[in-house]
């Protein structure tokens, strides 16, 4: 059960989807990818305050235990709940091929 | 592809399964759970250095971009890769029932 979407820390501070522009060089892909030359990387960034977008029961437990033992148990973390696929034109030993990656771009986010 | 399991930060410092003992009171469950009275909560704790247990391509991208833009892009985070189910004996309006939760205890961990 995804819990509340209201961010108590202020607009844009809590776990949400961000887009970061990255070149092949930034990603360390220049030696094996031809296209795209630049990727709009969607990723999950932001804080996970109590019960904000809690992914499941485990996330709720983590929130409770973090409140009790903050030095031992970390707060839940903002991670992808699902992904958007992306095609890469990549170099092979003999030339190029198209390869679709299902786990490259975050589609939406939750706290876990 | 789960990447290297060697922790460059020293034994036990990187993302792995930990067990934290918690009472029903700790978990905020005392008003709706009868048993167990104490839970051995398995959770994922630890650092995610470069390519350590990278869950997927997204995690690898995150590592690369964190290295470039540490103030903008956080490092990958240690989260459950899978879960162990657990049964709770819980209070109902009329008595008790058994309920199995599939997403309560972490089974193993990765970085994402």
């Amino acid at each position: 059960a995804r819990n509340g979407d209201h961010c108590p820390l202020g607009p844009g501070r809590c776990c949400r989807l961000h887009t970061v522009r990255a070149s092949l060089e930034d990603l360390g892909w220049a030696d094996w990818v031809l296209s795209p030359r630049e990727v709009q990387v969607t990723m999950c960034i932001g804080a996970c305050p109590s019960q904000f977008r809690a992914a499941n029961m485990h996330a709720q437990i983590k929130t409770s235990l973090h409140r009790l033992k903050p030095d031992t148990v970390p707060a839940p973390c903002c991670v992808p709940a699902s992904y958007n696929p992306m095609v890469l034109i990549q170099k092979t030993d003999t030339g190029v091929s198209l390869q679709t990656y299902d786990d490259l771009l975050a589609k939406d986010c939750h706290c876990i | 592809a789960r990447n290297g399991d060697h922790c460059p930060l020293g034994p036990g410092r990187c993302c792995r399964l930990h067990t934290v003992r918690a009472s029903l009171e700790d978990l905020g469950w005392a008003d709706w759970v009868l048993s167990p009275r104490e839970v051995q909560v398995t959770m994922c704790i630890g650092a995610c250095p470069s390519q350590f247990r990278a869950a997927n391509m997204h995690a690898q991208i995150k590592t690369s971009l964190h290295r470039l833009k540490p103030d903008t892009v956080p490092a990958p985070c240690c989260v459950p890769a899978s879960y162990n189910p657990m049964v709770l004996i819980q209070k109902t309006d009329t008595g008790v029932s058994l309920q199995t939760y599939d997403d309560l205890l972490a089974k193993d961990c990765h970085c994402i």
């Epitope: 296209s35 795209p36 696929p85 992306m86 095609v87 890469l88 034109i89 198209l98 490259l104 | -």
Partner: antibody, heavy 118, light 106 residues
Amino acid sequence: QVQLQESGPGLVKPSETLSLTCTFSGFSLSTSGMGVGWIRQPPGKGLEWLAHIRWDDVKRYNPALKSRLTISKDTSKSQISLKLSSVTAADTAVYYCAQMAWDWFAYWGQGTTVTVSS
Amino acid sequence: DIQMTQSPSSLSASVGDRVTITCKASQNVDTDVAWYQQKPGQSPKALIYSASYRYSGVPSRFSGSGSGTDFTLTISSLQPEDFATYYCHQYNSYPTFGQGTRLEIK
């Protein structure tokens, strides 16, 4: 494997609107980087790009034909439509749709022949 | 728009010959050039991407080179199935094709 199949009326009268459909399988237009383009080939001549549509719904048209072209997609049906208005005999051609990966026409359909005649 | 000028427009060659087709862009297109093969009654088939990279499944006798404005497609040793029309294509700006080179049996 990737497959694209063009369908059209075969014969269209001058001044009418030509409607073409491309039905594809083996890839998804929800995938970042994917698109579908339309290219035509008049009898005995070379290839002319008409339009394409991308995963993010960005549409591009050949500037020389832009006022007459409309491209659209139905991702759920894996179909792309192209409409060409006010046709003349010069629009007689084989019309191809092609899978695009980052602006490259990687795989082409077999084509559908369209004749403009009264 | 960017014009792609292919030469020759047609050429005759024999099985085993080495053949080179050239394509000149009217302005710099970096390496954003592809090559296609089309046999009579068939649709075009991708051969080369990014000026010099063979598409998967394309025989190694096909090679591409060039950058900027001048590009070549070379077939190192012609096979009977290679007689076809070849097109260059730039995708640096909105797509344009060369007029084609028809390769015939001598």
